[in-house]
């Protein structure tokens, strides 16, 4: 399908400031991480999927001198299909995931 | 609280391949967009929040020759607190949000 903007007459409602603020605050949020040779080695010639999603701290802090950093983290293990034509194998990999975040003073 | 990894004895379960794959596919997902002077003008000296979240296409495609692109989009309006000391004002801004995504051949 051709890229479609919404119909011009269709006026979306405005997202309220409190909702904008709440969603934007520093918190764990799902991010896409591309898989690299460092993570997955040199034997696999293709990985399916070639990226994964993990929870990482993101969003903004109320002051320029603060940054959003993890204060709780753990390793999460995931199954990845490793393809080395003509065979493939389900392997596992591990990535750091953030479970708690805080706005902390930026390191000088 | 100091940054805490999980207790060493606590072995998390492995995320199955189908779950990893489903979450990683090309789809609209929430991303954090920093607000800039270009977007908000030069009068406001501070914006609260200083970033917003919008739905944008992201994730990976099954082939290196494909990329995740929007096939449906719309403008979303949001309230932002614009501060110009000593006064402040609720303003509105508009950003593009993606509602549909597809893996399409990369442009040469």
């Amino acid at each position: 399908p051709v890229s479609q903007p919404d119909a011009p007459g269709h006026q979306r409602k405005v997202v309220s400031w409190i909702d904008v603020y709440t969603r934007a605050t520093c918190q764990p949020r799902e991010v896409v991480v591309p898989l690299t040779v460092e993570l997955m080695g040199t034997v696999a010639k293709q990985l399916v999927p070639s990226c994964v999603t993990v929870q990482r701290c993101g969003g903004c802090c109320p002051d320029d001198g603060l940054e959003c950093v993890p204060t709780g983290q753990h390793q999460v293990r995931m199954q990845i299909l490793m393809i080395r034509y003509p065979s493939s194998q389900l392997g596992e990999m591990s990535l750091e995931e953030h479970s708690q975040c805080e706005c902390r003073p930026k390191k000088k | 609280p100091v940054s805490q990894p999980d207790a060493p004895g606590h072995q998390r379960k492995v995320v199955s391949w189908i779950d990893v794959y489903t979450r990683a596919t090309c789809q609209p997902r929430e991303v954090v967009v920093p607000l800039t002077v270009e977007l908000m003008g030069t009068v406001a000296k501070q914006l609260v929040p200083s970033c917003v979240t919008v739905q944008r296409c992201g994730g990976c495609c099954p082939d290196d020759g494909l990329e995740c692109v929007p096939t449906g989009q719309h403008q979303v309006r949001m309230q932002i607190l614009m501060i110009r000391y000593p006064s402040s004002q609720l303003g509105e801004m508009s950003l593009e949000e993606h509602s549909q995504c597809e893996c399409r051949p990369k442009k040469k």
């Epitope: 034997v43 080395r84 065979s87 392997g91 591990s94 | -």
Partner: antibody
């Protein structure tokens, strides 16, 4: 499924040896064929592998200048040519059929003795 | 190159015992590890792949575990036919590399 290898080869120092490995047709065309060496009383060392369908190879850098892997698809046979032999090369050389990149099926091995 | 270290060169066990063979990779290899058994005068035989998946025909007294850099092959209820040398192998990155081996003998 076990690949077939000749039992032994006697070669002179400085010479070359070409070892063979015959596998069943279907397995041969759809698997990576690897070579692993084991010196007497020692551990195992991977030399390299070849995909008969394309002729694509991977080599252990340690053997890259002296080992050459080839295949004859018509006879479902893989070959390893090892050149400039010294007494250190006296060892058993296994032909292996790889599953992904672990060694699923091992030949009986060819014992190469380098001696004047 | 990734170095696979098997710290025990020799292990002694009685029939019916449980014995563990360990292997440490010099860098993270996820679950890309296999284990092999080699009896005197024979070719190696695969026991485990993907760190914990048992190869077909391998008795269930052989189990593999581990992730990242630390791996273990456990033989529960050791039998006399388990007298052999055990090797680990990583297939995360080229060149594929093996541990030096651990010999199991019976008391």
């Amino acid at each position: 499924v076990q690949p077939q290898q000749p039992g032994a080869e006697l070669v002179k120092p400085g010479a070359s040896v070409k070892m063979s490995c015959k596998a069943s047709g279907d397995t041969f065309t759809n698997s990576w064929i690897g070579w692993v060496t084991q010196r007497p009383g020692q551990g195992l060392e991977w030399i390299g592998d070849i995909f008969p369908g394309s002729g694509h190879t991977n080599y252990n850098e340690k053997f890259k200048n002296r080992a050459t892997l080839t295949v004859d698809t018509s006879s479902s046979t893989a070959y390893m040519l090892l050149s400039s032999l010294t007494s250190d090369d006296s060892a058993v050389y296994y032909c292996v059929i790889e599953n992904y990149a672990w060694f699923a099926y091992w030949g009986q091995g060819t014992l190469v003795t380098v001696s004047a | 190159d990734i170095v696979m270290t098997q710290s025990q060169k020799f292990m002694s066990s009685s029939v019916g015992d449980r014995v563990s063979v360990t292997c440490k990779a010099s860098q993270n290899v996820n679950t890309n590890v296999a284990w092999y058994q080699q009896k005197q005068g024979q070719s190696p035989r695969p026991l485990i792949y993907s760190a914990s998946s048992r190869c077909s025909g391998v008795p269930d007294r052989f189990t593999g575990s581990g992730f990242g850099t630390d791996f273990t092959l456990t033989i529960s209820n050791v039998q006399s036919e388990d007298l052999a040398e055990y090797f680990c192998q990583q297939y995360h990155s080229f060149p594929l590399t093996f541990g030096a081996g651990a010999k199991l003998d019976l008391k």
